[in-house]
């Protein structure tokens, strides 16, 4: 404790100018005042001040009035500090002195006289009224008055408690007269340390370092820290618990990635073909007759078929074609020949074989040449026979398709629906996907195929400890402890002071 | 294939202002809370400011407080930084970056340099 | 705010090495902990979140761990194209704040 026990001295009648002794003083009694203050006593005794003690300088002649001075010698009222629990309860004696020496130190003049005292013993509450009294003697009368008072930063009956105002890392208050701590606006907490949170900040998923804010545990987003944060690898998708991924309408997979939607998003099938979303890129082009490539962006040649034959030439023209025809062939398509055998028109080997009594021919070809003279070597991969990319390839006189992943038949025109297998459980509905094939499930069902039931989730297990609230989270071998104040850990089991709950994932 | 391409960076004096935007494609972007982190020349990341998806809460770092403002538009898949007098220590390539204060920041765009020089 | 203290500074090594690079936290960070690899003139590129999942495309010479305060990057086997500058960012507490970068140099 620490206060200050405060003296005022008002007024000192000697009109006599008389000492204790009954002597007068010559020319007048120069009085100053000796103050000692102790412990109770019920009969004042000599010996220390144990509480404290004062001199003032001189401070009048005989009779005078003392005037309130607040600084340097004289000063009044007298201070007698002390740094203790103030009792409750002392004694003081009050004396005054005759000088005949130096004014303002007259405790070091020789032949110093007594002039009077009183004694004063009593109890007296800490406070700010001050007690008045006038003690009166057979020569002299003195006024005077006083009171306890607490040192700064000390508060209580007994100035006892410390208290001082501060706005910093360790507390923001002031003090209130008994020294209890008034928190300043928007801090809380025994020692007002804890903020208070911007009002509505979500009690678990939010917390705050200075008055209305609200920052955000990881997982969590927004002005209230009531929203969740999509998984990082989710891009058209949504989330109820953070990290999670649901996915938009028209979009697949994991991560959300895959277009279920890509015929309708995208439009990539031109001249008028018509999209599935199926196929290794989510989307097929079935083309019109005349279109061919993968987007069926490519007309296809008039000429495309070969349709001259003998060796004639094709010409595209705009919405036909025309034949130019070798010597001895005419017709549309040069099929009309005006050689015969005796012209040798048998090319590579080829045998000839008169016919309408010699006036045309036919060649028969030997293996690996084709063409009505046998002028063209066997390419069976000439008219593209393969479909969907397919690979051509020569093998002697046949040819074989290799077909990509996902086709299958003699020209690789069949495709291999990867839901054909029906590979979704429990009414999942299946979308052929270039990575596989991708399940929506039904309302409790999880899962790649839909295999899972919710309700025996990662969570049924009861994985999280100490009042955690358990979620599934990406997948069902996933769980999502979220933490109560005080507790940290992917199950929430290990105790901690700072920080409060975390969501981990398991 | 998720894009986040900035633009808008240049030379300012101090004092000056300017406006920082960001396109964004390959995802929904109204689902996901978005960041702006720069990169002073031949230093480290330091975090600026983030925005929330859909409330557009934003948050700001104590160092650019009361000077930027992040904003966004999820109608036109954008996000904004508004800075205001800028100061020779803001002179650094600015990243768009999907991802909150609290947590990674999964994709980022190719930056933007922001020189304050008189 | 939370300090995030790399080492080393910079590193050398060769194709093939196994290299580690540590991440001190000034305080428990709770494995919410990323690994970012960034190249000359190009945007930084998230390799690991919460101390040890791999992000998506990320080869699996790259892995991560630890706990409390400390967390370690480890490339099993050094390719060409991991030469760059790598940071550790936490973002358990607000600020986030990222570490000073480790340049891995070829030796």
């Known amino acids: 404790g620490s206060g200050i026990f405060q003296l005022r001295l008002q007024e000192f009648v000697n009109q006599r100018g008389m000492l204790a002794n009954g002597q007068s003083c010559e020319p007048g009694c120069r009085t100053f005042f000796r103050i000692c203050l102790k412990h109770f006593q019920a009969t004042f005794s000599e010996g220390p001040c144990t509480f404290g003690n004062v001199s003032t300088p001189v401070l009048g002649t005989n009779s005078f009035v003392v005037r309130d001075k607040n600084s340097g010698s004289g000063r009044n009222p007298l201070q007698l500090p002390f740094n203790f629990t103030w009792p409750g309860t002392f004694s003081l004696n009050i004396q005054a002195w005759h000088t005949p020496g130096d004014d303002l130190r007259p405790e070091t003049s020789p032949g110093n006289s007594l002039i009077s005292q009183i004694i004063i013993q009593g109890s007296l509450a800490v406070g700010k009224i001050w007690r008045t009294d006038e003690q009166n003697d057979t020569l002299t009368r003195l006024s005077y008055s006083y009171r306890v008072i607490c040192s700064d930063n000390y508060y209580g009956e007994s100035c006892s408690r410390l208290c001082k105002k501060r706005d910093d890392h360790f507390g923001h208050y002031e003090c209130q007269p008994d020294g209890s701590l008034s928190c300043l606006p928007g801090w809380t907490g025994k020692y007002c340390d804890q903020p208070i949170c911007l009002s509505g900040c979500h009690e678990q998923n939010g917390y705050c370092s200075k008055p209305d804010e609200c920052i955000c545990r990881p997982g969590w987003q927004g002005r209230l820290c009531n929203e969740c944060i999509p998984h990082n690898g989710c891009r058209h998708g949504t989330c109820s618990i953070p990290w999670q991924c649901a996915c938009d309408e028209g979009w697949g997979g994991l991560f959300c990635d895959q277009d279920l939607n890509y015929c309708t998003h995208h439009s990539p099938c031109k001249n008028g073909s018509t999209c599935s979303n199926s196929g290794p890129k989510g989307y097929t082009c079935t083309c019109l007759p005349g279109y061919t490539g993968e987007h069926c962006e490519l007309g296809l040649s008039k000429c495309a078929s070969n349709p001259c034959r003998n060796g004639g030439s094709c010409k595209d023209q705009e919405n036909s074609y025309h034949c130019l025809c070798p010597p001895g062939y005419y017709g549309q398509h040069c099929e009309h020949s005006t050689l015969t055998c005796a012209d040798s028109p048998c090319f590579n080997g080829g045998s000839c074989r008169e016919r309408n009594q010699g006036s045309s021919y036919a060649c028969e070809c030997p293996p690996n040449f084709t063409g009505s003279n046998c002028e063209k070597k066997v390419d069976r991969c000439t008219s593209n026979p393969c479909a969907n990319g397919g690979q051509c390839q020569n093998r002697g006189p046949s040819r074989t398709c290799r077909c990509r992943p996902g086709f299958t038949g003699t020209h690789c025109e069949l495709h291999i629906s990867d839901c054909a297998r029906s590979p979704c459980a429990h009414g999942g509905t299946c979308h052929d996907l270039e990575n596989g094939p991708v399940c929506t499930c039904p309302a409790g069902f999880s899962g790649r195929r839909c295999e899972v039931r919710i309700t025996h989730d990662a969570c049924a297990s009861g994985p999280c400890f100490n009042g955690a609230t358990c979620y599934t989270g990406l997948s069902p071998n996933n769980f999502v402890c979220n933490c109560p104040y005080g507790f940290v850990g992917s199950r929430c089991e290990f105790p901690v002071g700072l920080p409060p709950s975390f969501p981990w994932v398991a | 294939e998720v894009q986040l391409v900035e633009s808008g960076g240049g030379l300012v004096q101090p004092g000056g202002s300017l406006r920082l935007s960001c396109a964004a494609s390959?995802?929904?972007?109204?689902?996901?809370?978005m960041s702006w982190v720069r990169q002073a020349p031949g230093k480290g990341l330091e975090w600026v400011a983030s925005?929330?998806?859909?409330?557009?809460?934003?948050t700001i770092g104590d160092s650019v407080k009361g000077r930027f403002t992040i904003s966004r538009d999820n109608a036109k898949n954008s996000l904004y930084l508004q800075m205001n007098s800028l100061r020779a220590e803001d002179t650094a390539v600015y990243y768009c970056?999907?991802?909150?204060?609290?947590?990674?920041?999964?994709?980022w765009g190719q930056g933007t340099l922001v020189t304050v020089s008189s | 705010d939370i300090q995030m203290t790399q080492s080393p500074s910079s590193l050398s090594a060769s194709v093939g090495d196994r290299v580690t690079i540590t991440c001190r936290a000034s305080?428990?960070?709770?494995?919410?902990l990323a690994w970012y690899q960034q190249k000359p003139g190009k945007s930084p590129k998230l390799l690991i979140f919460?101390?040890?999942v791999l992000a998506d495309g990320v080869p699996s010479r790259f892995s991560g761990s630890g706990s409390g305060t400390d967390s370690t990057l480890t490339i099993s086997s050094l390719q060409p194209e991991d030469f760059a500058t790598y940071y550790c960012?936490?973002?358990?507490?607000?600020?986030?704040?990222f570490g000073q970068g480790t340049k891995l140099e070829i030796k």
């Open positions: 925005i929330s998806s859909s409330d557009s809460w934003a």
């Open positions: 305080q428990e960070i709770y494995r919410n």
């Open positions: 970056a999907r991802g909150y204060y609290n947590s990674p920041f999964a994709f």
């Open positions: 390959g995802f929904t972007f109204g689902n996901f809370p």
């Open positions: 919460d101390t040890s």
């Open positions: 960012q936490q973002y358990t507490y607000y600020p986030p704040t």
